[in-house]
């Protein structure tokens, strides 16, 4: 089943942070406020509104056998995520155990730029992706992944670090964004919402997905993460949206079935090695790409973001397990661990496929396609 193609003229959730609406630095959202009733995390933030820092996702994936029936981003309806009528999850608490307020958190003090000034930068992540405004770049070739199918041994560390669930990856997982753009995978983590509330970091035409997986990579040009921070292309993140589907995702279940063991903040367990690529969509050829930042302090810029067009399907039960099992700081549930979308400030999102082509009669005006800057230039 394919959903109708998204329309260029569909309204975003309250405002645009697209390429055609660059904002000045003074309009950058701050990280300091927790979600408000009238500003549910599921909706696109207005430019200039306070940012809702958000949570991270766990890797969940669509079985390769379902590839044909999988959802594509350009097929999604342009409906805004409904606001949650219940009170928003309050993550802006003071830790009952005496948390040092200088350490960052999702929602609440301190403002992220106080933790790291880079969080007030002009080219931050996540962003709202508007396929109609993406620049089609034929030079963006299919992603290449090597060594992602791990044997059961050695086991991998799965950890609840209070901000997300994180799987540490061993040496040897190689990824190429293109010729001469080679990376090594370091770790993966997830961002999610809460019951009835989506929690992806990136959005598409204002639509927020239930969850999002991030696989973080270090350029082979650098030996250590610290050397790469803030350097263009020093870090690269593969991101995929997680959606609800009818069947259990067996790849994700290998991780989700272990979350109970790491329910407490700071706890960890060992899990058998698995096929990491099975946590990602099967179509490595269709994706969006832009230069942004880490989505948490230190918010270092120069990060190459690659967001898959194809989504990964998990069962409703699996998505519930993801959002309702872990605990974070101060005896609160680890939920809504996502940052609000940030203004593009003139950045152009590139697409490896013609995402802006729309044959629908609803498109009243011609689509203005942005020009492509060839990858590697």
């Amino acid at each position: 089943q394919r959903l109708p193609r998204m329309q260029e003229d569909s309204p975003l959730g309250g405002g645009s942070s697209g390429e055609d609406d660059p904002l000045g630095e003074e309009d950058l959202p701050s990280e300091e406020d927790s979600p408000r009733e009238e500003d549910p995390p599921g909706e696109e933030d207005l430019p200039g509104e306070e940012d809702l820092p958000g949570e991270e996702d766990l890797p969940e994936v669509k079985p390769k056998s379902e590839e044909e029936g999988s959802l594509k981003l350009e097929d999604l309806p342009t409906v805004e995520a409904p606001g949650d009528p219940q009170e928003p999850q309050n993550n802006a608490h003071r830790d009952k155990e005496g948390d040092d307020q200088s350490h960052w958190r999702y929602g609440g003090d301190p403002p992220w730029p106080r933790v790291s000034p880079a969080c007030a930068g002009r080219f931050q992540s996540p962003v709202d992706i508007r396929p109609q405004l993406a620049a089609f770049c034929p030079a963006l070739r299919p992603l290449e992944l090597l060594g992602f199918q791990l044997p059961p041994l050695p086991e991998l560390r799965l950890r609840n670090n209070g901000h997300s669930v994180q799987l540490t990856l061993p040496p040897g997982l190689e990824m190429a964004l293109g010729p001469g753009r080679e990376y090594r995978a370091l770790q993966l983590h997830l961002h999610w919402g809460a019951a009835g509330r989506p929690g992806s970091e990136h959005t598409v035409e204002g639509h927020r997905f239930p969850a999002e997986i991030h696989v973080v990579h270090l350029s082979t040009a650098f030996a250590r993460v610290d050397e790469a921070l803030g350097r263009p292309g020093g870090l690269a993140v593969l991101a995929a949206f997680l959606e609800e589907g009818p069947e259990e995702n067996s790849a994700y279940e290998q991780l989700l079935s272990r979350l109970e063991e790491i329910a407490e903040e700071g706890s960890e367990t060992q899990v058998p090695g698995l096929d990491i690529s099975a946590l990602l969509p099967s179509d490595f050829s269709r994706y969006f790409q832009y230069e942004g930042s880490l989505t948490t302090p230190p918010c270092a810029q120069g990060v190459i973001w690659t967001v898959f067009n194809q989504t990964v399907m998990l069962s409703a039960k699996q998505l519930h397990t993801l959002s309702d099992t872990l605990w974070g700081p101060g005896d609160s549930r680890l939920q809504l661990n996502f940052r609000a979308t940030q203004p593009l400030n003139g950045r152009v999102i590139e697409a490896s496929f013609p995402a802006g082509v729309d044959s629908s009669p609803r498109a009243a005006e011609p689509v203005q396609l942005n020009s492509c800057l060839a990858a590697g230039d």
């Epitope: 991270e56 350490h103 790291s116 209070g162 901000h163 903040e265 700071g266």
Partner: nanobody
């Protein structure tokens, strides 16, 4: 962003005590969980104990009741008090700081040898 330097290792007799320290520098406010891990010769690195900013602690079963992890945020220092040491505690002990996106930061390690 974050630098970690361990100290306090050495040779101690079975049943003795040692206190390890880990001095953290850089932007440590990006870190939520810190911990101690150890690696014995020919073995995988394993968890010893972790502590969150809020003071929540976790211990490996093998050290529960003998080791205590603590942190002094005012001094940016992580500690591991090790009592009732056994020969099997002999290992290189590493300080760790974990970031949601950047992953693990590690110190250079300090050797603890328990022998009579």
């Amino acid at each position: 962003q974050v630098q970690l330097v361990e100290s306090g290792g050495g040779l101690v007799q079975p049943g003795g005590s040692l206190r390890l320290s880990c001095a953290a520098s850089g932007n440590i406010f990006i870190i939520n969980v810190m911990g101690w891990y150890r690696q014995a010769p020919g073995k995988q690195r394993e968890l010893v104990a972790t502590i969150t900013n809020g003071g929540r602690t976790h211990y490996a079963d093998s050290v529960k009741g003998r080791f205590t992890i603590s942190r002094d945020n005012s001094k940016n220092t992580l500690y591991l008090q090790m009592n009732s040491l056994r020969a099997e505690d002999t290992a290189v002990y590493y300080c760790n700081a974990n970031h949601i996106e950047l992953g693990d930061y590690w110190g250079q390690g300090t050797l603890v040898t328990v022998s009579s």
